[in-house]
Interface confidence: low
């Protein structure tokens, strides 16, 4: 056993090169200096090591850096990153976006692994907030990244980062996430003109309050039905028939196909039937003519 762990004569590695793929696991352990490996990590990726051999190389780095790898090594891990556990990654201090990109590239095309999730978490916490460049990078690799964050985590996203968000990045966001993201988007896009503003803000409108929808209805935005159906029910209910007509423009005809679904169904129940009739769409279920409509929220405020 003692002889086995000693490096055979002439086999001591002077550099990390292809000759090492012919080394047995114990030879790699005995003949490759950990410090040499650390300085030449960028070469490892170009060499077709087996998974077993990569395990040995990882073990050598673990022994050299028991407190966690330095960033100079992390940046060049390549496929060795796939061998890391979340516990390993929690020891790292990754500050360079280039390092993050290099490691995300290794996992490209796959679902977000626990390793990648831990890496991103470490990186974002190290930066203190989710800045635009980071968000740009993360959503490029994982379009659903933003919607995987809790409302709590989203609250640390600065409005300037919202410029990096694409509509598809919000596809799986739920109402509480949009509640947090919408005010940031409104702030980020506030200096744009009407039509450009609507194009940018449209994906975030699931978090918009009634007053903002009323304002949009005055700007000839022609909101499509898919966007309208994603609006908060409580934000849609107070809108008048005239406001919804202006908000949807030519798309108002689509209300008929959606009349049984929220928020359209609930909105119809709140409107006077004669107002609904002015749309000429045959929408039914409004408050019959002659009935007194009590605004219960106003009544409660007065009591």
């Amino acid at each position: 056993e003692v002889e086995k762990t000693a490096c055979p004569s002439g086999k001591k590695a002077r550099e990390i090169d292809e000759s090492l793929i012919f080394y047995k696991k114990w030879e790699l352990e005995a003949c490759v200096d950990a410090a040499l490996l650390a300085t030449q990590m960028d070469r490892v990726n170009a060499i077709p090591f087996t998974y077993e051999q990569l395990d040995v190389l990882k073990h050598k780095l673990d022994e050299l850096y028991p407190q966690g790898y330095p960033e100079s090594v992390i940046q060049h891990l390549g496929y060795l990153f796939l061998k890391m556990s979340p516990e390993d990654i929690r020891k790292w201090n990754v500050t360079s976006l280039e390092t993050l990109k290099a490691l995300l590239e290794v996992n490209k095309g796959h679902e977000m692994s626990p390793q990648v999730a831990t890496l991103i978490d470490r990186f974002v916490k190290g930066r203190g907030q989710l800045d635009k460049d980071t968000l740009d990078t993360l959503t490029a690799f994982y379009p659903g990244y933003l919607c995987s964050l809790s409302p709590e985590e989203l609250s640390s996203v600065p409005p300037s980062s919202i410029w990096a968000v694409r509509p598809q990045d919000l596809d799986t966001c739920d109402p509480r996430q949009l509640d947090v993201l919408y005010p940031k988007a409104r702030l980020a896009f506030q200096n744009m003109n009407g039509s450009e503003y609507f194009v940018k803000i449209q994906s975030f409108l699931g978090g918009a309050p009634t007053e903002d929808l009323k304002a949009l209805s005055q700007q000839n935005v022609s909101m499509d039905l898919a966007t309208f159906m994603k609006l908060r029910t409580d934000a849609v209910l107070p809108l008048t028939v005239a406001e919804v007509q202006k908000l949807l423009g030519p798309h108002v005809e689509g209300l008929k196909a959606e009349e049984r679904h929220r928020p359209v169904r609930d909105w119809i129940l709140r409107q006077r039937q004669d107002d609904l009739d002015t749309l000429g769409l045959g929408l039914q279920g409004g408050i019959p003519n002659g009935y007194l409509v009590l605004d219960l929220s106003m009544q409660e405020a007065l009591s």
Partner: antibody, heavy 121, light 107 residues
Amino acid sequence: EVQLVESGGGLVQPGGSLRLSCAASGFTFSSYSMNWVRQAPGKGLEWVSYISSSSSTIYYADSVKGRFTISRDNAKNSLYLQMNSLRAEDTAVYYCAREDFSHKLGYFQHWGQGTLVTVSS
Amino acid sequence: DIQMTQSPSSLSASVGDRVTITCRASQSISSYLNWYQQKPGKAPKLLIYAASSLQSGVPSRFSGSGSGTDFTLTISSLQPEDFATYYCQQSYSTPLTFGGGTKVEIK
């Protein structure tokens, strides 16, 4: 061990004010969003208000909007609920609850023992 | 607001019985549903989160299922300490809302 201890409850007349406090210990308070939940005598649970860890996001139930104010002091590990214009229907045991997340889904894993607020003339 | 409707509002059962409580949301809430147990004079206790994930330390006789609008809490074999009131709660959107509760009593 996570501990949440509410205080500040008591008897108050309709229209009066009260300030509830919740002292947190056993965890990094500044990392968690917090909530107030109440329970009227013999009734079910009703969520009252939410505040994110940095106070940047705040939500209220419609029944208390404009009358109650939630706040926190991370340096003091404390959560507060300022209750103004109190009504008889605000009579309840008020709990503070820590919100935990699994992925992006929130749930109340840790609760205080509650403090009773009675609004009566 | 999303309304949560629990049924039954109360039920009587014996030790060893299989008990099922249902909770219905007024609109789809995906899996954003939690279940709590509350005993008289005590704070609620988390049993199940994310519709079906068992909270650490909760006995395996408790299980949750469902997605969208219909959810179920099942106690496979009722124990004496399980007599309490159970609440469902959605965390899909604010205001966060609870079901009206189901009181499980001894038959």
